[in-house]
């Protein structure tokens, strides 16, 4: 039975040209995390594999940085980066847990950030 839950940064906003940390945290399970995938609606941003480390997709290599932790840092944000992001935790023996973050990239010089997420 899957008992875990994923906490995310939820809905966040950031300024065009700036950077943002996408963060998820899996709790309430003793399952082993074997891999975490970061995805947009139609493409893979990055994978963090427990054995093999990080793989950043070629299309994002110049502006995506791994971490902190299992999170992902998006840099040089553009308005086109607005949209849904998913953290997909592959675990054993539970299976797959998915978290959703909505990022809005704002043109204005004042971007209201959601509450900064802290890993417990």
């Amino acid at each position: 039975m899957m008992t875990g839950t994923i906490e995310t940064t939820g809905n966040i906003s950031a300024e065009k040209g700036g950077s943002i940390i996408l963060q998820c945290h899996l709790s309430s399970t003793t399952a082993q995390v074997t891999q975490v995938n970061w995805e947009q609606q139609d493409q893979l941003l990055a994978i963090c594999n427990a054995d093999l480390g990080w793989h950043i997709s070629p299309s994002f290599k110049d502006r995506v940085a791994p971490g902190p932790g299992l999170g992902l840092t998006l840099q040089s944000l553009t308005v086109n980066d607005t949209g849904e992001y998913f953290c997909i935790y592959h675990t054993y023996p539970d299976g797959t847990y998915t978290g959703r973050i909505f990022l809005e990239v704002l043109e204005s010089s004042v971007a209201e950030h959601g509450a900064r997420f802290q890993i417990p």
Epitope: Q35, N37, L44, I47, L52, G53, H55, P58
Partner: antibody, heavy 121, light 107 residues
């Protein structure tokens, strides 16, 4: 340039253990690569067997997990495959390959030329 | 395990033709898909990774596209050396799995 070369017996008896070695040249085992085994039965497609990472972690195909061991000998620039309790269904060409995970994910960029293994009494 | 299905399983074409091979996964693999070329008696060669990125030294007549579960591999203008068998592979999650292959033959 990186080169991989498989070696081992071409004939193994049923119920015995198949043992293969892959020797890597033109490359040091100390850097961030993983090493994989793949096989191809005669006239058929490719099957991933498993990998060993630079940190000595292994990951095996569940269909073979109970019979497979992959290990590495960094001093010899070699990694090896052991497959126990073989049957005729294990007859295949066995390939070793390199995983540059940081750059290519689970796509394998350098392969050995393959070694043919027949399981027969 | 994620099943990979390639179509067609074989294909006849002529030098200069544009050829398209499709690969479908049984589950979502995002853009974690690779394409290999294999000639008889030889080992596979990596052509495309991450669905659309060409491996170093691969001619630009080879291209890949797609995401999710449906992928396409295209050779824009067939050359004599391109007649071979082509395999897709998902590298989204282990066990990494391959398609059954598409044999490209001379018409």
């Amino acid at each position: 340039d990186v080169q991989l070369q498989e070696s081992g017996p071409g004939l193994v008896k049923p119920s015995q253990t198949l043992s293969l070695t892959c020797t890597v040249s033109g490359h040091s085992f100390t850097s961030d690569y993983a090493w994989s085994w793949i096989r191809q039965p005669p006239g058929k497609g490719l099957e991933w067997i498993g990998y060993i990472s630079y940190s000595d972690s292994t990951n095996y195909n569940p269909s073979l997990k109970s019979r497979v061991t992959i290990s590495v000998d960094t001093s010899k620039n070699q990694f090896s495959l052991k497959l126990s309790s073989v049957t005729a269904a294990d007859t295949a060409v066995y390939y070793c390959a390199r995983l540059d995970y940081g750059n290519y994910g689970g796509a394998m960029d350098y392969w050995g030329q393959g070694t043919s293994v027949t399981v027969s009494s | 395990d994620i099943q990979m299905t390639q179509s067609p399983s074989s294909l006849s074409a002529s030098v200069g033709d544009r050829v398209t091979i499709t690969c479908r996964s049984s589950q979502h693999v995002s853009t974690a898909l690779a394409w290999y070329q294999q000639k008889p008696g030889k080992s596979p060669k990596l052509l495309i990774y991450s669905a659309s990125s060409r491996y170093s030294g691969v001619p630009d007549r080879f291209s890949g596209s797609g995401s999710g579960t449906d992928f396409t591999f295209t050779i824009s203008s067939l050359q004599p050396e391109d007649f071979a068998t082509y395999y897709c592979q998902q590298h989204y999650i282990t066990p990494w799995t391959f398609g059954g292959g598409t044999k490209l033959e001379i018409k």
